[in-house]
Amino acid sequence: EFICEVSKVTSQVEVNCDNKGLKALPPGLPGDTAILHLAENPLGAFSTALLGPLTRLAQLHLRQSQLTQLQVDGMLPRLETLDVSHNRLKSLPSLGRALPALTTLDASFNELVALSPGTLDGLSHLHELYLRGNKLKTLPPRLLAPTAQLRKLNLADNRLTELPPGFLEGLGELDTLYLQGNWLRTVPKGFFGDLLLPFTFLHGNPWSCDCEILYLARWLRDNSNNVYLWKEGVEAKATTPNVDSVRCVNWKNVPVHTYQGKDCPSPMDGGDMDYDNYDDEDEKLPGVEAPATRAVVSFSTHTKAHTTHWGLLYPTFAYPDHQMAYLSSTLELTEKQTMFPSTLGPIMPTTTPEPTTPPTTLEPTTTPTTPEPTTPPTTLEPTTTPITPEPTMPPTTLEPTTTPITPEPTTPSTTPTTPQPATTPTTPQPATTPTTPQPATTPTTPQPTTTPTIPELPTPPTTPEPTMPPTTLEPTTTPTSPTTTLILSESNTFLGIPELTSPCTTSEYPIVPSLVHLPEAHEVARGTSDSSRNHRLFNPDLCCLLPL
């Protein structure tokens, strides 16, 4: 008997084989299958050639299927949606020849370190591209050239240190751009061109407020109604613009849009300061002693924002008017955590020392690099119920300067991954993340015996984002008990990776339990969580932050 559930949605045959323990395609798939769910199966590798007989296939969902390899070697002429999120893919094959009708590609939360320039060649109908939560450091300049119809682009929570000039050129339909949670210090002049971008997310980057940032500062002023702070479980169009969320890492932590670069050469001095042919440089911003310009607010009729993968609530680097609890966001489960000493130098991205060598003095201008471990770090399997470490003693915290509160995770009022009804776990439009079965026991978060002092945050937090270009110290020992370090900032200034002036020390501070495991909104809503591999707290990158 066929083990998958068959139904019909909007005239399409939908086959749900989620979480059936499948290591390969099940026999007996209906030939008229249009929507195929294969999520949460230990598939390991997958080839589209196996689906050749399914001539009507329009959606293929392979979320969290332990994929290490994806072969796109069979033509699927009607496939519109491909979801390979939450897997272990290190690269994406070229897709256009086999999947010419693709409109939505979700490869979020994989291990992509680079994309080849031709990955998207032939995908002329692509509307939505989700690459959140990978390890991308750079992007091919012409990556998006074939995708002129692109509307939503999510590059959040990667390791991008730069954006190629002209990267968005020709993307006249683009309405939503997620770039939060990267290692970006500036954007190239003219990067946004004349795009009408109603929804842009830029927080959580170490924006370096110097003369090169003036283009971004001006763009932010002119598009202040289009810049948002990612809020858990809230669609972009339902949130309030927050241009202040984009902040200087090195210049008093001020919002980038207020930075005026008083010492920078002006166009009259021969410097290249023009901004897309704007010419009035004489108006004043309130409270800022520098020239500004009129506000040009752009709107678009495209207002839908993708909500399959939830963004993180706080900017990674600094949040306006609040002290920030900087939690090491990508911690390996090790017996001891390495911490940097308190003698700190300039706050800049730095080269990551190899774990086997003593730390060296790192120059502030160095481009961040993340060495691969000599042996692969041990990670938890995706099917493992996430672990919440028990505190061994009341958590040690540093005293904040603002009123302390203990943040709690927020559960969204609705299950956001199901925009279209009657399709749970079936097919909302245009794509959905299939639901996850409940674990036998819901992971609980132990409460500390004494309430930890935590800096005030505006709203309950979610899984903390990486707080800067992380210095990755890969452990060479097998990970064991999860003790984690919580570091609190006492100043409003961003705490980035410091210049090391003395060797690292080792200590064993337990983490505040209520911050240990904060699943994403769609997980909270289901009362379950994804594999610990997908949570930043259990990611094999260690990032240490200390107060100045």
């Epitope: 068959v6 139904s7 019909k8 949605v9 909007t10 005239s11 399409q12 045959v13 209906p30 030939g31 008229d32 299958t33 925009p419 279209q420 009804p421 009657a422 399709t423 079936t426 439009q429 245009p430």
Partner: antibody, heavy 118, light 113 residues
Framework: QVQLVESGGGLVKPGGSLRLSCAAS????????MSWIRQAPGKGLEWVSS???????YYPDSVLGRFTISRDNAKNSLYLQMNSLRAEDTAVYYC????????????WGQGTLVTVSS | DIVMTQSPLSLPVTPGEPASISCKSS????????????LAWYLQKPGQSPQLLIY???TRESGVPDRFSGSGSGTDFTLKISRVEAEDVGVYYC?????????FGQGTKVEIK
């Protein structure tokens, strides 16, 4: 013109089995999805099962595992094998045609009465 | 499952007068990809099988008089008869054809006053 004629209804004891048939004519049977819909005495309509033109069956939870829909395109016939019958399965069973891959029912048969009683 | 709720359950009408039946779904029947609402209306005349009147909310089946019209979107739908005739009596059912299991309303019995 399109005609659908059901047969095979009757009286059966709880736990018993019955096989309904629907003879189709007046259209290219193999090109259409077909369904069974029932109506308990004095009550409303309830969908029982469907089968696509490609032969893919699907069911509501209320009959899943007990009823099996099938078709024989060579004989222009639709079938419903009903096992483990219960008193609440008592109803007039209609055979209905769907247009293409859509799921509204543009032609209905006259129905056959199934009574499950001890 | 999507629950369909009709009102009123009984509708006495006067020939020549208009009539209106409401149908509400527990979830939206709008497919955002094609902007179609997946709702159909049937009439079951006394002693007969149901017959299709309208599908996709407002598309009349061939042979159905133009005094029947359907409207609505999302979760709220209406069937209107502009001028009721004696032959229009019977039970009217709405049905969602958005996602299986296909579900029907309880029915609205239209009878002449």
């Amino acid at each position: 013109q399109v005609q659908l004629v059901e047969s095979g209804g009757g009286l059966v004891k709880p736990g018993g089995s019955l096989r309904l048939s629907c003879a189709a004519s007046g259209f290219t049977f193999s090109s259409f999805a077909m369904s069974w819909i029932r109506q308990a005495p004095g009550k409303g309509l309830e969908w029982v099962s469907s089968i696509t033109s490609a032969g893919t069956p699907y069911y509501p939870d209320s009959v899943l595992g007990r009823f099996t829909i099938s078709r024989d395109n060579a004989k222009n016939s639709l079938y419903l094998q009903m096992n483990s019958l219960r008193a609440e399965d008592t109803a007039v069973y209609y055979c209905a045609r769907s247009r293409g891959y859509e799921d509204y029912f543009d032609y209905w048969g006259q129905g056959t009465l199934v009574t499950v009683s001890s | 499952d999507i629950v369909m709720t009709q009102s009123p359950l009984s509708l006495p009408v006067t020939p020549g007068e208009p009539a209106s039946i409401s149908c509400k779904s527990s979830q939206s029947l709008l497919n955002s990809r094609n902007q179609k609402n997946y709702l159909a209306w049937y009439l079951q005349k006394p002693g007969q099988s149901p017959q299709l009147l309208i599908y996709f909310t407002s598309t009349r089946e061939s042979g159905v008089p133009d005094r029947f019209s359907g409207s609505g979107s999302g979760t709220d739908f209406t069937l209107k008869i502009s001028r009721v005739e004696a032959e229009d009596v019977g039970v009217y059912y709405c049905q969602q054809h958005y996602s299986s299991p296909w579900t029907f309303g309880q029915g609205t019995k239209v009878e002449i006053k």
